[in-house]
């Protein structure tokens, strides 16, 4: 079924949003960023077994192909449909400022 | 360009509820990180924290005035509220907002003087 | 809750002259911010984390410390530097402000 929701994997195994707990030293930004100091980072990971979450038609023909040529068509892959926006403080060379990132975060996840 | 502005009733009597309403723009509470905090200042004399309202609704108040607050918000209208109940003179003051990037109060709005007698 | 104490409360000075402004903790905080307000005005911040300028703020400014103990230093006193100064704190809720410090210029 198109969008399908239910995974024959087993629970977690499949497409979703997760959080991992990264510090400013994890993700290289120490030297750029001032706050936070640790950022709850929600991210897509998971498998895209059959039909589960396709985004649309072609992730959709991209399983149906997996199936048929593995080593030639790669599965869809677990990424985000749509994104929350997470405010930096950050350092520049005129000093420290806010800037606001639209795609920092995810907020849902499909298969494409 | 972000801009916040308070607004209140300017003068208000002993024991009533003081409302007050931050209107801001340039920035967006539903963003992660982002809050509107709430300061006041009486005349002449220095700032005292009153209230945070973040963008996961999460909101903590000064302990000694925490029983006399309320905040909300309404994200859709970048409008902030603050409910003061059963002021007294020493609720006089200078009322800002601002707005609160982590733990950084970056941009304040002009505040609004409040009178209660 | 964690008091900050700023001295001196008034401090006069003259043009170019080096001023250094003090603000205690009760207890240990990670970090201070400081803002200044001019007469009149709303607060803005001048130094965020200690020591890290902001955005717009001349290089005269600068701020250090660690602990309880804080210090925000002006290398060359301006007219335009009149104003009152306070430090901050967020290390634990309450956050709170030092009482201030007034700069007067001779």
């Known amino acids: 079924a198109r969008n399908g929701d239910h995974c024959p994997l087993g629970p977690a195994a499949c497409c979703a949003l997760h959080t991992v707990r990264a510090s400013l030293e994890d993700l290289g930004w120490a030297d750029w960023v001032l706050s936070p100091r640790e950022v709850q980072v929600t991210m897509c990971i998971g498998a895209c077994p059959s039909q589960f979450r396709a985004a649309n038609m072609h992730a959709q023909i991209k399983t149906s192909l997996h199936r048929l040529k593995p080593d030639t068509v790669p599965a869809p892959c677990c990424v985000p449909a749509s994104y929350n926006p997470m405010v930096l403080i950050q350092k520049t060379d005129t000093g420290v400022s806010l800037q606001t990132y639209d795609d920092l975060l995810a907020k849902d996840c499909h298969c494409i | 360009q972000v801009t916040l502005k308070e607004s209140g009733p300017g003068i208000l009597q002993p024991s009533q509820t003081l409302s007050l309403t931050c209107s801001f723009s340039?920035?967006?509470?539903?963003?992660?990180?982002?809050?509107v905090g709430w300061i006041r200042q009486p005349s002449g004399k220095g700032l005292e924290w009153l209230a945070n309202i973040w963008w996961n609704d999460d909101k903590y108040y000064n302990s000694a005035l925490k029983s006399r607050l309320t905040l909300s918000k309404d994200t859709s209208n970048n409008q902030v509220f603050l409910k003061i109940s059963s002021v007294d003179t020493a609720d006089t003051a200078t009322y800002f907002c601002?707005?609160?990037?982590?733990?950084?109060?970056?941009?304040w709005g002009q505040g609004t003087l409040v009178t209660i007698s | 809750q964690i008091v900050l104490t700023q001295s001196p409360a008034i401090m006069s000075a003259s043009l170019g002259e080096e001023i250094t402004l003090t603000c205690s903790a009760s207890s240990s905080v990670r970090y201070m911010h400081w803002y200044q307000q001019k007469s009149g005005t709303s607060p803005k911040v001048l130094i965020y984390?200690?020591?890290n300028l902001a955005s717009g703020v001349p290089s005269r400014f600068s701020g250090s410390g660690s602990g309880t103990f804080y210090s925000l230093t002006i290398s060359s006193v301006e007219a335009e530097d009149a104003a009152d100064y306070y430090c901050?704190?967020?290390?634990?809720?309450?956050?709170?402000f030092g009482g201030g410090t007034k700069l007067e210029i001779k």
């Open positions: 340039g920035f967006s509470l539903n963003t992660h990180g982002m809050g």
């Open positions: 984390s200690t020591s």
């Open positions: 901050h704190q967020w290390s634990s809720y309450p956050w709170t």
């Open positions: 601002a707005q609160v990037a982590w733990d950084w109060f970056a941009y």
